[in-house]
């Protein structure tokens, strides 16, 4: 047993160097490991071929070191390996394509805080039993076509917390399975109307605090068994264009956020869900040089981008603005309000568990800037719509062991608390 | 820096109800899972109910099932575990505390990472 | 009901010395543990969480490992101030279980 560590073999054969300063992996690991936990450290690299001889290890934790470089092989023989917690490696930034083929019993992979820029091609290729993938909180800006591809039994995907500022059509294909997809706090300005097509199992989605003024209704159609939405904290245009998705909503039986309105301007701050159907007419139009809000590709049918509700036709030339008032949206769509400008919100009266399950509070926090949060940071801010009775997924046993968010052996994303006690 | 609060010390007659209050600060309350551990004088933590964020409801311990009910106040970001019932052995101290895990910061850990500071409830004829 | 079993029940150690703690979940728990310390007269502080994960403000000598069923806290180089009760707690499921507490002595 390495020096640093202590090696135990009941009820698994284990090696736990946790927080003793090392700045390599060990030598002399036991071959005969089932669960090597080396997390809080000072290592930086991980060398090829790393825990070769460790045949039947199922459990790696290499979390809160400073991993800097992980080589391609640095995994190579662990095809027993389920779990794999690489999480808060700030300075990462990358990993090879390679580096986790082979891992086909993996079932849950944390790289969540890992500084991130980048999905390499074929990163996740032939994990074919993933079931957890921790992705927030890193530097991603986009999600390559079928990146996931291979994930057929991924249940939950992070992906909060980043850059993301588009989903493309082909960034979900392949996850049949996928029960939560958080997208929550990215910059996210436009969903292909096909992104979702293969989410048929999807339950939970969470598009909160992005950068959507629209969003098209045939990307919701194929989420049948979706239960929870939140679509809050975002610069909504509540005007003709989004009449499909105020629709759309009306005959949603799920729980979703509200809606708040950014344009125009006499909606401001207003629900869409609760607007009524003529509330959404004309079209809202920001001011200096012409920059349409709409943000999908110019067409035959939305020349400049504009849908077709909004084309002025011969006999209206006034229909592109809001009835009524002068082309100017002001800065509704400029900036967000920093985080912790705003006081947090208070609902008012006692609160019920049969409450609203969503509600809004005022402010907005930016998605973050920083590649990442040392552990044990609260977030920007305060969360801007915190639900209260946030949503779960049904069971009756009560327990955390089939459906609780970063199950699966899993430590779940995120941080810890920064207040003292 | 978020804080709890409770309420002062209290000593009741075996029969009577308590409740004990634990007002939030730093942090709405609506954003927050609270849960109440007692601790009988000597003795270890004991769990009595909460929060459960994923199912979306209040959840007790079976042993105080009926006699305890945790509410909330928005308004005021003030939680309150009402005990009924009370007997000798419901001499204790008694915690409210934050859970780790709210969704919005992509926190999925559970575990009470803020403690009030404890309330000491005797009962006594 | 998911029950916690703790050993030792006390330990008594000297300054430096490093020192182990043990945790037994009746059931799998994964990684679903979190480990309390509290000091007379005090409330609990929550040391780890998901078994391995530091909770903030927390010297670098506590460190938890363990998954399944067995888990560990360890304390290395012990100080005069860790002179505590220790609490493991099961955050799988409800209802919420402790463990029986490790009385931690500093000779």
């Known amino acids: 047993c390495p020096g640093a560590c202590v090696c135990y073999n009941e009820p698994k054969v284990t090696t736990s160097c946790p927080q003793q300063g090392l700045q390599a992996v060990p030598v002399g690991i036991p071959a005969a490991s089932q669960r090597i936990f080396l997390h809080g450290n000072r290592i930086s690299h991980v060398p090829a071929a790393s825990f070769r001889a460790c045949r039947n290890l199922t459990i790696l934790w290499l979390h809160s070191n400073v991993l800097a470089r992980i080589d391609a092989a640095a995994f190579t023989g662990l095809a027993l390996l389920e779990q794999l917690d690489l999480s808060d490696n700030a300075q990462l930034r990358s990993v090879d394509p390679a580096t986790f083929h082979g891992l086909g019993r993996l079932h849950t992979l944390h790289l969540d805080r890992c500084g991130l820029q980048e999905l390499g091609p074929g990163l996740f290729r032939g994990l074919a039993a993933l079931q957890y993938l921790y992705l927030q909180d890193n530097a991603l800006q986009a999600l390559p076509d079928d990146t996931f591809r291979d994930l057929g039994n991924l249940t939950h995907l992070f992906l909060h917390g980043n850059r993301i500022s588009s989903v493309p059509e082909r960034a979900f294909r392949g996850l049949h399975s996928l029960d939560r997809l958080l997208l929550h706090q990215n910059r996210v300005a436009h969903v292909h109307p096909h992104a979702f097509r293969d989410l048929g199992r999807l339950m939970t989605l969470y598009l909160f605090a992005n950068n959507l003024s629209a969003l098209p209704t045939e990307a919701l159609a194929p989420l049948r068994a979706l239960q929870y939405l939140r679509l809050n904290d975002n610069p909504w245009v509540c005007d003709c264009r989004a009449r499909p998705l105020w629709a759309w909503l009306q005959k949603f039986r799920g729980s979703s956020s509200e809606v708040p309105c950014s344009l125009p301007q006499r909606l401001a701050g207003r629900d869409l869900k609760r607007l009524a159907a003529n509330d959404l007419q004309g079209c809202a139009v920001a001011t200096g040089p012409y920059h349409p809000i709409w943000t999908g590709r110019a067409t035959d049918e939305e020349p400049l981008g504009l849908p077709k509700c909004c084309q002025p036709d011969a006999a209206d030339k006034a229909s592109v603005l809001e009835p009524g008032r002068p082309a100017s949206a002001g800065n509704a769509l400029k900036g967000r309000v920093p985080p912790g400008d705003s006081p947090p919100g208070n609902g008012s009266g006692p609160r019920h568990i049969n409450d609203s399950p969503f509600g809004t509070l005022p402010g907005s926090a930016e998605p973050p800037l920083t590649a990442v949060r040392p552990e044990g940071s609260e977030p920007p801010g305060f969360p801007t719509s915190g639900p209260r009775r946030r949503p779960g997924c049904s069971r009756k046993n009560r327990t955390r062991s089939h459906c609780r968010l970063g199950q699966a052996g899993s430590g779940g994303g995120g941080t810890g608390d920064s207040e003292g006690s | 820096q978020m804080q709890l609060v409770q309420s002062g010390a209290e000593v009741k007659k075996p029969g009577a109800s308590v409740k004990v209050s634990c007002k939030v600060s730093?942090?709405?309350?609506?954003?927050?899972?609270i849960h109440w551990v007692r601790q009988a004088p000597g003795k270890g933590l004991e769990w009595m109910g909460g929060?459960?964020?994923?199912?979306?409801?209040?959840v007790y311990a079976q042993k105080f099932q009926g006699r305890v009910t945790l509410t909330d106040d928005t308004s005021t970001d003030t939680a309150y575990m009402e005990l009924s019932s009370l007997r000798s052995e419901d001499t204790a101290v008694y915690y409210c505390?934050?859970?780790?895990?709210?969704?919005?910061?992509?926190?999925?850990?559970?575990?009470?990472?803020?403690w009030g500071r404890g309330t000491m409830i005797t009962v006594s004829s | 009901d998911i029950q916690m079993t703790q050993s030792p029940s006390s330990v008594s150690a000297s300054v430096g010395d490093r020192v182990t703690i043990t945790c037994r979940a009746s059931?799998?728990?994964?990684?679903?543990l979190a480990w309390y310390q509290q000091k007379p007269g005090k409330a609990p502080k929550l040391l780890i969480y998901?078994?391995?994960r530091l909770q903030s403000g927390v010297p670098l000598r506590f460190s938890g490992s363990g998954s399944g069923t067995d888990f560990t806290l360890t304390i290395n180089s012990l100080q005069p101030e860790d002179s505590a009760t220790y609490y493991c707690?099961?955050?799988?499921?409800?209802?919420?279980?402790f463990g029986q507490g490790t009385r931690l002595e500093i000779k």
């Open positions: 707690q099961q955050t799988n499921n409800f209802p919420r279980t």
């Open positions: 505390a934050r859970d780790l895990g709210y969704l919005t910061s992509g926190n999925y850990y559970d575990a009470f990472g803020i």
């Open positions: 998901a078994a391995s």
């Open positions: 059931q799998d728990i994964n990684r679903w």
């Open positions: 730093g942090y709405p309350l609506s954003e927050l899972s």
């Open positions: 929060f459960d964020s994923e199912d979306d409801e209040t």
